[in-house]
Every structure is written in structure tokens, then in C-alpha cells.
């Protein structure tokens, strides 16, 4: 990989962990004990973003998998997906905008705003075992705050 990256896991503000749900979807649920090993480990890469931006642009890949979170329009709605990439070419210093998230830290919590769709955030539902998605509201029912746990490489 040609860019700095670190391995981490993410939990939402309700302490739900993120796990794979099928080959191209993440879901959020509470895990305990040995089940914690199911949670997805991300490789967070530090990439170039907008010059004037005061947010930290990152790409979120799944560790040792050629899958990245990306934001695309589906049925005219910004949508979060896991996209398969060529591992020989990713991550790279100038990631396509759909792969870039602005990491925003507020009161020790993290938000991940889509660079492609400003004011749309990686979100989880209050309910258990539901897909991780791209949400267009903050401070409502859906959860947009996360904490990051570091995993040694």
C-alpha cells in the first residue's frame, strides 16, 4: 500500500460492533466475549481530500480483503456499499471520491461523512442486527457517532 494506514475496529455510540452480513454488506449488533472476533477490522488509509477542507479524509477498507466502503447513487439516493477493487491498485493516494470519508471528531466521538455526498454519514439503526447504511440526518433516531479501537498490525 502506498499510503499510511492503520488497523482499527469501529463501534457505534450504543457499543454495537460491525460485522459482515453476506459478501457485500455490514450490519451492527452487540457482541460479547469470543463473538467479538466476528467484528470487521478496517484498514483506515489517510488519503488526499479537498484542499480547503478542515476534515480528515480517509478510505475504509476491510483488512486483507479487496473491499472498500463506497458511496454511490442508487435509485437517486446516496447509498453505502462494499465495493470490490483490484488489490494491486488500492489503496492509493488519490482515491476516487466515492471511497473517501471525512473523519470528523467531536467530543471524542467520530463521524464519517461521505466526501461524495456532503451531510450524508455512515449510520447504524437503533435496532439490532440491521445493515450499516448512509444516512442523511444527524441527531435523529439513527446513529452517526462511532468510537475507534486500534488493532496492532
Amino acid at each position: 500500500a502506498p499510503v499510511r494506514s492503520l488497523n482499527c475496529t469501529l463501534r457505534d455510540s450504543q457499543q454495537k460492533s460491525l460485522v459482515m452480513s453476506g459478501p457485500y454488506e455490514l450490519k451492527a449488533l452487540h457482541l460479547q466475549g469470543q463473538d467479538m472476533e466476528q467484528q470487521v477490522v478496517f484498514s483506515m488509509s489517510f488519503v488526499q481530500g479537498e484542499e480547503s477542507n478542515d476534515k480528515i479524509p480517509v478510505a475504509l477498507g476491510l483488512k486483507e480483503k479487496n473491499l472498500y466502503l463506497s458511496c454511490v447513487l442508487k435509485d437517486d439516493k446516496p447509498t453505502l456499499q462494499l465495493e470490490s477493487v483490484d488489490p494491486k491498485n488500492y489503496p492509493k493516494k488519490k482515491m476516487e471520491k466515492r471511497f473517501v470519508f471525512n473523519k470528523i471528531e467531536i467530543n471524542n466521538k467520530l463521524e464519517f461523512e461521505s466526501a461524495q455526498f456532503p451531510n450524508w454519514y455512515i449510520s447504524t439503526s437503533q435496532a439490532e442486527n440491521m445493515p450499516v447504511f448512509l444516512g442523511g440526518t444527524k441527531g435523529g433516531q439513527d446513529i452517526t457517532d462511532f468510537t475507534m479501537q486500534f488493532v496492532s498490525s
Epitope: A1, P2, V3, R4, S5, L6, C8, F46, V47, Q48, G49, E51, S52, N53, D54, K55, I56, P57, V58, N89, K92, K93, K103, E105, F150, S152, S153
Partner: antibody, heavy 127, light 106 residues
């Protein structure tokens, strides 16, 4: 003034240990990753390892040539980073530098992917 | 492991343009930096993120990076620019340096 100052170098016998310090001033020390480098006499620059800032867990990475022998740590309350060198070899003889690195790209002004402040170096001789 | 290759030496007359190259496999996909080091001194960052110049570095220093080659260009070279120049890139979380180029201003 933003600066880094290395200390702790000296003459040491092969197989022994030495701890170098890198003290920062004039900036928020904990916000930066810190690298250690070395330069053998008349030779080029060689990266030794780095430690991430507190926002990224203070985790470390090392060059293959020192992995298992050298350990980097930091005490942000004192604005000091350390390089603990064990099982020293004659080939570890060099001037050792620390520098700071912005490990993320927040804007065009933060020197992301560049090491903008270097210390003056401290000499380690293993003989 | 990843390697960066620089010419050992480059000579230039005062006022002329000096170009120092750095080659590595798909280097253009990585961020390249350049450091200047004068005898007995610590390195100084002169170019970062391929093309950007830190504050305090003269405009005569510029950088480019594409394909397998990064280039440091010094236009209107001055005697004070005589130094060793090192290219540097990241290979994953490892920092890699070129062997250095001694720039002589004739």
C-alpha cells in the same frame, strides 16, 4: 520556536543497550506521529521506525533491520519520545534523528506526507 | 522490499536548472518527498506530497511525480543549493529513502 532535540547518544559496547530521547517544544506534541531515523558515517538516511499520535493509539511500526531489538515509546505529558535500543551491533553506529510527521491530510497547510521538523541528531557509536 | 534509485551526483552551473530524479516501481502512485541535507546538518523538507513546497522554501524548488519517476527541479540554481538531496516515499507504513544525490554547483 518549533523544535525537536535528541539526547542520550554515546559510546556503547556490542550487545548492550541505550535509550535515546527526543524532546519537542513549541507545538502540541501528542498531535504528531514521530519517526526515528539514522545515518551511518558518510551514508544515506535510513528509517528506523515511528510511533503514531494519541489520536491513533500511539501504535508503532519498525524497519525490518531493528524489529525485535528497538522499541519506540512516547510520554506526551513530557513531550518526549524514546528509542530503546537493545542488543546493539556495530552496524547500529550512526547519527540518530527524530522528526515529526503529520499522519493525516487535514488541509493543504499541514505537511501531510512530509516530515517538516527534524532534530539536530545524537551520535551512537557501538564499538 | 521497496527501493528508490537516485543518481549519485548531479552537476549544474550557477543560474542553470538542476533536475534530480528518483525512480521506483509505480512511484507515481505514492507520495514523494524531497529533503536537502548540507554537511553536518539535519535534513530539511523541500518538497512534500509530490509538488508542495513548505513555507520558507524558495520558489525555485519544484517537484513532480508520475509513472515510475519523481523529479526535483531547482531552477536558477544558487551556490547555497549545493547539498545532498534525498527522495523519500511511503510503502505501506514503511518509510523508504533513495540513496541520495550530491548536487554540485560548479
Amino acid at each position: 520556536e518549533v523544535q525537536l532535540v535528541e539526547s542520550g547518544g554515546g559510546l556503547v559496547k556490542p550487545g548492550r543497550s541505550l535509550r535515546l530521547s527526543c524532546t519537542g517544544s513549541g507545538f502540541t506534541f501528542g498531535d504528531y506521529a514521530l519517526n526515528w531515523f539514522r545515518q551511518a558515517p558518510g551514508m544515506g538516511l535510513e528509517w528506523v521506525g515511528f510511533i503514531r499520535g494519541k489520536a491513533y493509539g500511539g501504535t508503532t511500526e519498525y524497519a525490518a533491520s531493528v524489529k525485535g531489538r528497538f522499541t519506540i515509546s512516547r510520554d506526551d505529558s513530557k513531550s518526549i519520545a524514546y528509542l530503546q535500543m537493545n542488543s546493539l551491533k556495530t552496524e547500529d553506529t550512526a547519527v540518530y534523528y527524530c522528526n515529526r510527521e503529520v499522519e493525516y491530510c487535514r488541509s493543504s497547510e499541514n505537511y501531510c506526507y512530509g516530515m517538516d521538523v527534524w532534530g539536530q541528531g545524537t551520535t551512537v557509536t557501538v564499538s | 522490499s521497496y527501493e528508490l534509485t537516485q543518481p549519485p551526483s548531479v552537476s549544474v552551473s550557477p543560474g542553470q536548472t538542476a533536475s534530480i530524479t528518483c525512480s521506483g516501481d509505480k512511484l507515481g502512485d505514492k507520495f514523494a518527498c524531497w529533503y536537502q541535507q548540507k554537511p553536518g546538518q539535519s535534513p530539511v523538507l523541500v518538497i512534500y506530497q509530490d509538488t508542495k513546497r513548505p513555507s520558507g522554501i524558495p520558489e525555485r524548488f519544484s517537484g513532480s511525480n508520475s509513472g515510475n519517476t519523481a523529479t526535483l527541479t531547482i531552477s536558477g540554481t544558487q551556490a547555497m543549493d549545493e547539498a545532498d538531496y534525498y527522495c523519500q516515499a511511503w510503502d505501506s507504513n514503511t518509510v523508504v529513502f533513495g540513496g541520495g544525490t550530491k548536487l554540485t554547483v560548479l
